[in-house]
């Protein structure tokens, strides 16, 4: 027997869509072989209508697609705008049509519900609003208006014009009688439930001259939209529930087994711990639509997600909802990168950020995830030469090593730097990764003086002590600016005496500034690297002042001014610029963004919590 499995019978009505899932054993060969959907002919052949290799029959043009989900061993055929001509016998299969790897599917499309027996059909999505219109004649204008629901053989009163409301509809139904000019009354039912579906009868008057109108209410559950994203990548759920719920709390939840739908995030401030650091709920538009970005996708993130609106901020009967089925592809194109980087107070970290190597010219960004409210990610630095004011002198984004990876270096670490950071670009929205910076106990490995004062016209020598653990690394000094750190010549002064229990492999490397000018004032970094891969750094601020007495300054660790404490540093900070990553659609539109720093893109940001690898910053 064939190992392919699917629905043996599919029944639908004209105008509807079907989504046919075919299951196959997910062997390596099966995952990558051709998938097809064909129609069986009277003489036994099977004519391909659509295949995974891009073929689409003219009969299916613009109304069908085939999506393979190799990780799950399934492929899905979606067919829209069904007509009775689509009724017939089909096969879904793998490989060549005539081979045995297939499954027979019978599709039957019947005529859609018409206006039989003067019945008006209302087809409305779950949680939405329906207005049932009920015409009447002049002689019944002053008489009682009512709406009944047919339950089994009996009509049950739902609402009438005397003020009665059936308890099942309390708080979500009203009866409106139009002005005298119109012979019409309307019944409006909000927050539609599946149980509201059925046959209704509206009536004006109670005697044999009453006017009656039949209505058939169909309440549709949303068919989940299939979403397929890479492990460690990101997904954006765009949720458009309509302006009628613009002011109602919104939520995204993940269905567990049973009827539970566990809140992932909502606009009331709730967020599931598993998504800490890797989720943003982007502010809603006036029409009530919003989006949720989840980054650093993990295998366990796969499942059904619902977004909805309800005052409780969670799924309730009658919530308008949208549904997605998320598949997480483990054969990911997004490389593994450390999800945790550790550094010590006063030390540094170097974070490697992956990006789509096809987009080497894209603008790179780094932002700090903030959990307050619905989550935001204010930008800290970009590859175009902008650095947030508070981070001047201690943060740099480098295009190295290139070819799909850029580097972010942050030094002068304090406990307040602990948190989640997102790497992103203005290119591929799926390539957003995250890293958590943890501040651990320990001393910085590189030793430099605190802030240093140089004298105009004189020579300044600034030492940097490298422990022996960095003996095989390239050691450098550079001058920081907002586009990077420009390398400067330095001198190896031999072994350092700054380390206890460290042999001759320790090193003292000095930066010499000859004939100091005002332009020499600023931040200087010493650091280590291996090729294009950066390690630890230490920063020194060099101030320049007028000559007091002739001579040169040779700064030692002992003589150097103590680094100002954080409070002093903070007092010099200016107001934070509003550079928050929020709107995931900004870069999706192919138009020039005048200043991405004021309106950067949340959907570009991504957290990779998908692996447990860690990367050390300073000493562990």
């Amino acid at each position: 027997k064939s190992p392919i499995f699917g629905p043996e019978e599919v029944n639908s009505v004209e105008g509807n869509s079907v989504s046919i899932t075919c299951y196959y054993p997910p062997t390596s060969v099966n995952r990558h072989t051709r998938k097809y959907w064909c129609r069986q002919g009277a003489r036994g052949g099977c004519i391909t209508l659509i295949s995974s290799e891009g073929y689409v029959s003219s009969k299916y043009a613009g109304r069908a697609n085939l999506t393979n989900f190799p990780e799950n061993g399934t492929f899905v055929v979606n067919i829209a705008q069904l007509s009775q001509d689509d009724s017939g016998r089909y096969k879904c299969g793998l490989g060549i049509n005539s081979r045995g790897l297939s499954f027979d599917v019978s599709l039957e499309v019947s005529q859609g519900p018409g206006l039989l027996n003067d019945t008006k059909v209302y087809t409305v999505d779950l949680g939405r609003t329906v207005t049932i219109n009920c015409p009447f004649k002049t002689e019944n204008a002053q008489k009682r208006k009512s709406l009944y629901k047919q339950i089994g053989l009996y009509p049950v009163l739902v609402i009438d014009s005397s003020g009665y409301v059936n308890p099942n509809y309390t708080g979500r139904i009203r009866l409106d009688i139009q002005g005298t000019g119109q012979l019409l009354f309307s019944v409006v039912i909000n927050q539609l439930r599946l149980s509201d579906a059925g046959q209704y009868l509206c009536q004006a008057g109670d005697d044999s001259n009453s006017n009656k109108k039949n209505a058939d209410l169909q309440v549709l559950k949303p068919e989940p939209e299939l979403v397929y994203e890479d492990l460690r990548g990101s997904v954006t759920f765009h949720c458009a529930l309509g302006p009628e719920v613009a002011n109602v709390a919104k939520f995204l939840c993940r269905q567990s087994s049973g009827e539970n739908c566990d809140v992932v995030v909502n606009t009331l401030g709730k967020r599931a711990p598993a998504f800490e650091g890797r989720i943003l709920l982007n502010p809603q538009d006036k029409d009530g639509s919003f989006s949720v970005v989840i980054t650093g996708l993990r295998k366990e993130d796969a499942g059904r997600y619902l977004c909805g609106a309800h005052s409780d901020g969670q799924l309730q009967e009658g919530s308008p909802i949208q549904a997605w089925q998320l598949f997480v592809n483990e054969e990911s194109t997004i490389p593994r990168s450390p999800t945790v980087v550790k550094g010590v107070a006063g030390g540094s970290v170097a974070v490697l950020c992956p990006y789509n190597r096809k987009e080497s010219k894209s603008i790179k960004y780094w932002c700090l995830w903030e959990g307050a409210q619905n989550g935001r990610c204010p930008l800290l630095v970009d590859s175009e030469g902008w650095v947030k004011a508070q981070y001047e002198g201690r943060l740099s984004l480098l295009e190295e090593p290139g070819n799909g990876t850029f580097t972010v270096i942050l030094n002068q670490l304090t406990s307040r730097d602990a948190g989640f950071y997102w790497c992103l670009t203005n290119g591929d929205t799926l390539w957003r990764t995250t890293v958590e910076i943890k501040i651990i106990e320990g001393e910085p490995n590189l030793k430099v003086p605190g802030n240093v004062t140089a004298v105009l016209g004189e020579t300044l020598k600034v030492p940097c002590h490298f422990p022996c653990k960095f003996s095989s690394y390239e050691k450098y000094w550079c001058k920081w600016n907002n586009t990077g750190c420009q390398a400067l010549p330095s001198q190896d002064e031999g072994p350092s005496k700054a380390f206890v229990n460290c042999d001759e492999n320790s090193r003292l490397v000095s930066l010499t500034l000859n004939l100091v000018t005002r332009a020499d004032e600023g931040w200087y970094w010493c650091g280590v690297k291996q090729g294009h891969f950066y390690g630890e750094t230490a920063a020194v601020y060099v101030a320049v002042e007028e000559r007091k007495a002739a001579g040169s300054r040779d700064v030692s660790l002992a003589k150097a001014d103590a680094a100002p404490d954080e409070k002093v540093l903070d007092s010099g900070f200016r107001e934070i610029e509003n550079k928050a990553i929020q709107d995931p659609r900004l870069f999706a539109e192919e138009k020039a963004v005048a200043d991405t720093r004021d309106q950067a893109d949340g959907s570009r940001a991504s957290v990779d919590s998908g692996s447990s690898e860690e990367q050390g910053g300073s000493s562990r």
């Epitope: 629905p7 599919v10 029944n11 989504s19 559950k221 087994s257 009827e259």
Partner: nanobody, 126 residues
Framework: QVQLVESGGGLVQAGDSLRLSCAAS????????MGWFRQAPGKEREFVAT??????????YYADFVKGRFTISRDNAKNTVYLQMDSLKPEDTAVYYC?????????????????WGQGTQVTVSS
């Protein structure tokens, strides 16, 4: 919670027919599919048939061993699913369980189903 109650089991001769019913009550939102599984003495529970719906579209799935003999159907108004079993064989003897799921996955997988009935015994004598 969703409660499922099976009925219609019994003792029949080989070649006869039976119709099993499964009535769902309680909070049936947002159930997407209901199905039948069976468990013969000393064997594991196995998939028999499932019906899944979305609006006015429905999908029916069957195990190979029941194809052409069993038919699954549902009555939306009554929240009931039926399994019409024709041409019964002695090897169809088992406890038949009704199950419901809110998740969209492989309809054959037991762990996709959150709600289960107590089961109804079907015995086919030769």
């Amino acid at each position: 919670q969703v409660q499922l109650v099976e009925s219609g089991g019994g003792l029949v001769q080989a070649g006869d027919s039976l119709r099993l019913s499964c009535a769902a009550s309680g909070r049936t939102f947002p159930t997407y599919a209901m199905g039948w599984f069976r468990q013969a003495p000393g064997k594991e529970r196995e998939f028999v048939a499932t019906i899944r719906w979305s609006g006015s579209t429905q999908y029916k799935y069957y195990a190979d061993f029941v194809k052409g003999r069993f038919t699954i159907s549902r009555d939306n108004a009554k929240n009931t699913v039926y399994l019409q079993m024709d041409s019964l064989k002695p090897e169809d003897t088992a406890v038949y369980y009704c199950a419901a799921t809110t998740l969209l996955g492989d309809p054959r997988a037991l762990n996709e189903y959150a709600y289960w009935g107590q089961g109804t015994q079907v015995t086919v004598s030769s």
